[in-house]
């Protein structure tokens, strides 16, 4: 019986540790996508509706803030699209990019952790164009550090929650 009690306590401890593991999955706020054809920061994301969720991390001022030191897996998926019903592209040669950036408040500095994308030729003869970028990586993050997303050509972003999103989850502690 004692062994069983010990075992269930162990399960509970494991479960609560897992439940305390920080994670976030943020989806684009389609009502507030900035305009521009140059690199812009995406600051409006959902954290509590649809697929979006957050736990033991903070979302503030367009940035995902780390609350616990640790090794995290960061990911971002950005979809760009254009359909002729919205008009014509002013230029057919496009650089479609995403940048995942880490900002440290303690030692004011900013680093691009990941970038992805391509130059594209989206011909005016086609009715529809689509391009998707997915980046992911394993990073040591400290409490207080902030993760943000920058993209080129935000007016071409696909605003669906299954298309444009980013997130993080803690994988292990820093030894």
């Amino acid at each position: 019986e004692k062994a069983m009690v010990d075992g269930s306590w162990l399960d509970l401890a494991k479960r609560s540790k897992l439940e305390a593991q920080p994670f976030a999955h943020l989806t684009i706020n389609a009502t507030d996508i900035p305009s521009g054809s140059h690199k812009v920061s995406l600051s409006s994301w959902y954290h509590d509706r649809g697929w979006a969720k957050i736990s033991n991390m903070t979302f503030s001022n367009g940035k995902l803030i780390v609350n616990q030191d640790g090794f995290y897996y960061l990911y971002a998926n950005i979809c760009f699209r254009h359909h002729e019903t919205s008009g014509d592209l002013a230029t057919e040669y496009l650089q479609l990019m995403v940048y995942v950036t880490k900002t440290s408040i303690k030692i004011p500095s900013s680093h691009t952790l990941m970038k992805g994308g391509s130059t594209k030729y989206w011909s005016g003869n086609s009715e529809f164009h689509f391009y998707s970028i997915n980046v992911g990586g394993f990073f040591k993050l400290r409490s207080g550090e902030e993760i943000s997303i920058e993209v080129s050509n935000p007016s071409l972003l696909d605003p669906d929650q299954d298309a444009t999103y980013f997130g993080a989850f803690k994988v292990r502690d820093i030894d």
Partner: antibody, heavy 126, light 103 residues
Amino acid sequence: QVQLVQSGAEVRKPGASVKVSCKASGYDFSNYAIHWVRQAPGQRLEWMGWINAGNGNTKFSQKFQGRITVTRDTAASTAYMELRSLRSEDTAVYYCARDSTNMVRGIIIAYYFDYWGQGTLVTVSS
Amino acid sequence: EIVMTQSPSSLSASVGDRVTITCRASQSISRYLNWYQLKPGKAPRLLIYGASSLQSGVPSRFSGSGSGAEFTLTISSLQPEDIATYYCQHTRAFGQGTKVEIK
């Protein structure tokens, strides 16, 4: 205030060419596209083509492809539309119109014509 | 190629009347629809863009609604200066126009 001022009325014989100008003022000419639209007597408005005043990119209606040239002079803030091999059916009022999209903020030419020229009557008659 | 169809082609109404013009697209165009006013010898004027957004400087008696393939322009209280031909437009395609006259 934003203004588009077009050149005066023209009379041409069939087979000839005409070049209509559209002078812009009151905004940064290079940041917007200019469209050309015409209206023949008793007909609906008809889109002809656009030019991105910033980079000179153009797009034309299939109907006018090969007969139309649209250019711009950024220093003079002026767009030009030349139509060649004129026929009597080309008798119309020709308008230039500004696209509402500021190219600094976006790259989609949205076809919202927020300012128009006063129109240029082109008569094609033998 | 999308075709825009307006109805009626002309109408006559009294000052103060509510006037409604309909525009249909041959396929769904979301909310990418604009309305223009044309008066003879004058530059055309953008009234409504994006189906329902009122262009700056346009009187509030003009309003637009609809999405998909069916749209309407409404003049809530017709004024003498509203005598004109009204056109709907989606990108490269225009409707055939509706001529509005005063009774």
